[in-house]
Interface confidence: medium
């Protein structure tokens, strides 16, 4: 399964929207910075598209879940958020189409499960942080920047997979 070129463009649009969503300068929020422990190795270790697609799908699904909460709607610009949902939804569809075609179904299921679990735990840490910080503007800004960084890293992985073929 080849992810369409539009998927790559969609990833870039998603990053652009995340950048546009920024409301305050993180310089104002230095004390709120937090290391969420992005499981980068779970992306770096998956050398085959078969192993990667379910992990990427989980990543995007979790981003969608995080930004579609009531607290998120209150924090961000509604128009940008709607565009953001649309881009994420399209990417989920692209990845699901690949899974349906049989990619990622048979190979190393345990390895994939561990990776998916690591991604879920990463987002649990983010959710807990937001709760502890009472969904403050700085907490949301820290999370937005973190998601942008981790999404960018996973996007780079997609690109490197495409270039390997």
């Amino acid at each position: 399964c080849d992810l369409p070129q539009t998927h790559s463009l969609g990833s870039r649009r998603t990053l652009m929207l995340l950048a546009q969503m920024r409301k305050i300068s993180l310089f104002s929020c230095l004390k709120d910075r937090h290391d969420f422990g992005f499981p980068q190795e779970e992306f770096g270790n998956q050398f085959q598209k078969a192993e990667t697609i379910p992990v990427l799908h989980e990543m995007i699904q979790q981003i969608f879940n995080l930004f579609s909460t009531k607290d998120s709607s209150a924090a961000w610009d509604e128009t940008l958020l709607d565009k953001f949902y649309t881009e994420l939804y399209q990417q989920l569809n692209d990845l699901e189409a690949c899974v349906i075609q049989g990619v990622g179904v048979t190979e190393t299921p345990l390895m994939k499960e561990d990776s998916i679990l690591a991604v879920r735990k990463y987002f649990q840490r983010i959710t807990l942080y937001l709760k502890e910080k009472k969904y403050s503007p700085c907490a949301w800004e820290v999370v937005r920047a973190e998601i942008m960084r981790s999404f960018s890293l996973s996007t780079n992985l997609q690109e490197s997979l495409r270039s390997k073929e």
């Epitope: 995340l18 950048a19 920024r22 305050i24 300068s25 993180l26 310089f27 104002s28 230095l30 004390k31 910075r33 820290v142 920047a145 973190e146 942008m148 960084r149 960018s152």
Partner: antibody, heavy 124, light 107 residues
Amino acid sequence: QVQLVQSGAEVKKPGASVKVSCKASGGTFSSYAISWVRQAPGQGLEWMGWMDANNGNTGYAQKFQGRVTMTRDTSTSTVYMELSSLRSEDTAVYYCARSLFPTIFGVEVAFDIWGQGTLVTVSS
Amino acid sequence: DIQMTQSPSSLSASVGDRVTITCRASQSVSSYLNWYQQKPGKAPKLLIYKASSLESGVPSRFSGSGSGTDFTLTISSLQPEDFATYYCQQSSSTPLSFGGGTKVEIK
């Protein structure tokens, strides 16, 4: 490769103001935060404040609050630092410095690119 | 405000020596600690960020370690071009602050 080019040396009288410019070339200007750091002759480094080149937000060290103003001109990719009510202790080399990562990715407040420095001498 | 204290303030060493500079923060700065090198008449140059991450283009003989309040910059084998002044800087909270500097001189 991004470069920060600062304006030339200045000699000022006590009580006057000085405005130092820092022009970015060869890269995306608005994605980064710019800080100003000064160094008195034979002394260490002292952080004065920052400006987010994207939206113009600023933050100043308490010590300089009320005396320092940082502004930007996006059309020329230039950031300015104005220091007023100058006194002899303000004699120093003033540096502008760029944050290591784009502010959209968060702030790792390390400075990877520096201007060449502007010597400001305050003397009667 | 967080105070940064470097030691020693100066040291003499020979080419090939292993050099260690320490930096202590008046309160925890987590791993938000950077190291710079400055030569006379020049702007500082970033060596290490976030306590131990080597800035691109910086030789691997430079390394950083530590977290909380105590940090170390190590030069594993001093080279002629390493004679300079070294500063630590905390980026845990504003106002950002620098250590007083450590001048590394030729023995």
